[in-house]
């Protein structure tokens, strides 16, 4: 069970979680793994235990304390390792020095609200969560708006490349409706990737006048 | 571009030491597990020794394991195997090599290893 291909990704969402995935083809779906952290220059230490996301990865939080307490800074090194049990042993399967702030990867944007909207047009707003005062404004966001009859996938992406926590969307249909996405990234690390996507928000542009063009 | 050179090298008689060096460019040291392995004549790439980014972990193989020691410098971009109590079975060409994340798989450690220097070779006699 222990000679598939592994892999495990680690990011820090800036405040007060490190999420793990531990993945491996072959292994047993009961296997009992734990993740461990060990800081260079904290008190604490931390264990969470891996829980099955699909049939060959696993997955946990570290949850360091409060959600918006800044518990870590680019100078800390946390060592993080996968413990598994093999019998009565435990065996380390993967072991890395994680740099928090080469591997973030912030909270999905939330509260996403329609500030204004016309036939054409449409101005929407949302605020970042759990996000370091770190960051100052050194942060980018995409959007993307969910068509009729499209995917997803297939809608075009949108690049705001600084701190704006809004964007008004132009050249709309009248009286169709859409859905909107945000999603954001730091500027900062290496190995730092976008957040998830935000909750969808629906909203409908206004009819046309009636006897206008 | 990634650029490893590895420098140290040269004969000694059995149960003498040697410290290699690997000089590191081109990548941010530090955000990678870095591994020594070597090639005897005749033999396949054997793996030796294994460290994480900033050195709060290592690994190596029984062969070496209580006479190797691996290390690193961040600050230097630099990482060394100091070699100790040498046999004639350690005689090889050494290797550095990077990994390609900071995470390092102890069961494989052959694992995700994307670049090696040229090597320096080291021969234990009498």
């Known amino acids: 069970a222990v000679n598939g291909t592994s892999r495990f990704t680690c990011f820090y969402n800036s405040r007060a979680n490190i999420s793990c995935v531990w993945s491996q083809d072959g292994a047993l779906q009961d296997t009992s793994c734990q993740v461990h952290a060990w800081p260079d220059r904290r008190r604490w230490n931390q264990t969470c235990e891996l829980l099955p996301v699909s049939q060959a990865s696993w997955a946990c939080n570290l949850i360091l304390g409060t959600p918006d307490s800044q518990k870590l800074t680019a100078v800390d090194i946390v060592t993080l390792r996968v413990m598994c049990r093999e019998g009565v042993r435990w065996r380390m399967m993967a072991i890395q020095d994680f740099k928090p702030f080469e591997n973030l990867r912030l909270m999905a944007p939330i509260s996403l609200q329609v500030v204004h909207v016309e036939t054409h047009r449409c101005n929407i707003s949302w605020k970042i969560s759990q996000a370091s005062h770190y960051f100052e404004r050194h942060l980018e966001f995409e959007a993307r708006t969910l068509s009729p009859g499209h995917t997803w996938e297939e809608a075009p992406l949108m690049t705001l490349k600084q701190k704006q926590e809004w964007i008004c969307l132009e050249t709309l249909t009248p009286d169709t409706q859409y859905e909107f996405q945000v999603r954001v990234k730091p500027l900062q690390g290496e190995f730092t990737t976008w957040s998830p996507w935000s909750q969808p928000l629906a909203f409908r542009t206004k009819p046309a006048a009636l006897g206008k063009d | 571009q990634v650029q490893l050179v590895e420098s140290g090298g040269g004969s000694v008689q059995p149960g003498g030491s040697l410290r290699l060096s690997c000089a590191a460019s081109?990548?941010?040291?530090?955000?990678?597990?870095m591994s020594w392995v070597r090639q005897a004549p005749g033999k396949g790439l054997e793996w030796v020794a294994s460290?994480?980014?900033?050195?709060?972990?290592?690994d190596y193989a029984d062969s070496v394991k209580g006479r190797f020691t691996i290390s690193r410098d961040n600050a230097e971009d630099t990482l060394y195997l100091q070699m100790n109590s040498l046999k004639p079975e350690d005689t090889a060409v050494y290797y550095c090599?990077?990994?390609?994340?900071?995470?390092?798989?102890?069961?494989?450690?052959?694992?995700?290893?994307?670049?090696r220097g040229q090597g320096t070779q080291v021969t234990v006699s009498s």
């Open positions: 090599a990077k990994y390609s994340s900071s995470t390092y798989y102890p069961p494989t450690p052959a694992r995700g290893r994307d670049y």
């Open positions: 081109g990548f941010t040291f530090s955000n990678y597990a």
């Open positions: 460290i994480t980014g900033f050195g709060r972990g290592t």
